[in-house]
Amino acid sequence: EGAAQPNNSLMLQTSKENHALASSSLCMDEKQITQNYSKVLAEVNTSWPVKMATNAVLCCPPIALRNLIIITWEIILRGQPSCTKAYKKETNETKETNCTDERITWVSRPDQNSDLQIRTVAITHDGYYRCIMVTPDGNFHRGYHLQVLVTPEVTLFQNRNRTAVCKAVAGKPAAHISWIPEGDCATKQEYWSNGTVTVKSTCHWEVHNVSTVTCHVSHLTGNKSLYIELLPVPGAKKSAKLY
């Protein structure tokens, strides 16, 4: 019984790990800006799942910087006072209020690029980020509900006769565990102080023609399947194989 997925149900595909830190962004290039200008302004808020330990770039509405008066990034993180990073074009000055996380910075000089970057995203970066652009034509907003994703560590083992245990440890949000074939299963969820969740599913198969069982773990960071051969010997421990 995994946690409900966010509304956009964005499934991040797993890929081969690069040595460089992966980076994600919802920013648009110049061509997209002109095509989607009005559409983006209407989409004020975006739910955005981001993998932990990657870099993230958050963008302001696609307004030409020459039309700008003030850019403000408002950052609301759990249990902290609201942090604001502001840039005033007329005086070319920046100001920060209640901002303590050094990993959250302007991408470059705000007079050249209004984007915000988070270097090495951590669980504590879960929160709401909003860019407010003040122009002669009015104020334009773009907000992000940033959901930090943590890939669970998946294990599968047999701990008793015809009983297997599949665990998705310390994931965020909670993973969902399913079995093929279905057995007599009990699932536990545990919530940890660092914001992660462990899901443990213990299943028993009474039917003796079931020799191999598969644990399928669904998670926003990607899915994983492990299978194991059920041993007849009580108490025998056997590790799983990855598909």
Epitope: I123, N159, A186, E190, W192, S193, N194
Partner: antibody, heavy 119, light 108 residues
Framework: QVQLQQPGAELVKPGAPVKLSCKAS????????MNWVKQRPGRGLEWIGR????????HYNQKFKDKATLTVDKSSSTAYIQLSSLTSEDSAVYYC????????????WGQGTLVTVSA | ENVLTQSPAIMSASPGEKVTMTCSAS?????MLWYQQKSSTSPKLWIY???KLASGVPGRFSGSGSGNSYSLTISSMEAEDVGTYYC???????????FGGGTKLEIK
């Protein structure tokens, strides 16, 4: 309502083992982990380890790995902790406490068993 | 292992006085729990999810904090608040539950 019942006290000779019990009632015993916590007189709380009654999976604080063994009896909804080769350092109150679910901690505690190691 | 350091170890307050105790974590957390323990009794869950009061806890108590730094505050000290308060976390792989060393609160 949830209850965790523990005997009040145990007097043990140095070098001997002791097995303490914690009888659970008011909930499905196999649905929650059972933890054990040690408190020496006038001192703080230390987590010893925990056991999943559904399949007897255990996690131990490394400090207590050679001292404590956790077991359960599902038929009587009782959790046990066996402490080996007792010394004066083991004189303490031992609490059982239920964890699991939405709370990353222990919502329910037993009254504790005072273990006194004395010749 | 995430080490929790509480300060002060012992404090005393007069009735009506505001009381604040802190808990520092060696690794960043999303949630902190607090327990209250009175002499010769089991600990009681007092605050969970950093700032939510457990059932039966008076409204003069509050919790706050984020990341590595958390605090428990009593807006107006009362005699029944005497006891030892422990911060608590559960996380890690392998799992480890840890308690802070405790803050003993006495009344003047």
């Amino acid at each position: 309502q949830v209850q965790l019942q523990q005997p009040g006290a145990e007097l043990v000779k140095p070098g001997a083992p002791v097995k303490l019990s914690c009888k659970a009632s008011g909930y499905t015993f196999t649905s929650y982990w059972m933890n054990w916590v040690k408190q020496r007189p006038g001192r703080g709380l230390e987590w010893i380890g925990r056991i999943d009654p559904s399949d007897s999976e255990t996690h131990y604080n490394q400090k207590f790995k050679d001292k404590a063994t956790l077991t359960v009896d599902k038929s009587s909804s009782t959790a046990y902790i066996q402490l080996s080769s007792l010394t004066s350092e083991d004189s303490a109150v031992y609490y059982c406490a239920r964890s699991g679910g939405w709370l990353p901690g222990f919502a329910y505690w037993g009254q504790g068993t005072l273990v006194t190691v004395s010749a | 292992e995430n080490v929790l350091t509480q300060s002060p170890a012992i404090m005393s307050a007069s009735p009506g006085e505001k009381v604040t105790m802190t808990c520092s974590a060696s690794s960043s957390l999303s949630y902190m729990l607090w327990y209250q323990q009175k002499s010769s009794t089991s600990p009681k869950l007092w605050i969970y999810d950093t700032s939510k009061l457990a059932s039966g806890v008076p409204g003069r108590f509050s919790g706050s904090g984020s990341g590595n730094s958390y605090s428990l505050t009593i807006s107006s000290m009362e005699a029944e608040d005497v006891g030892t308060y422990y911060c608590f976390q559960g996380s890690g792989n392998p799992l480890m539950y840890t308690f802070g060393g405790g803050t003993k609160l006495e009344i003047k």
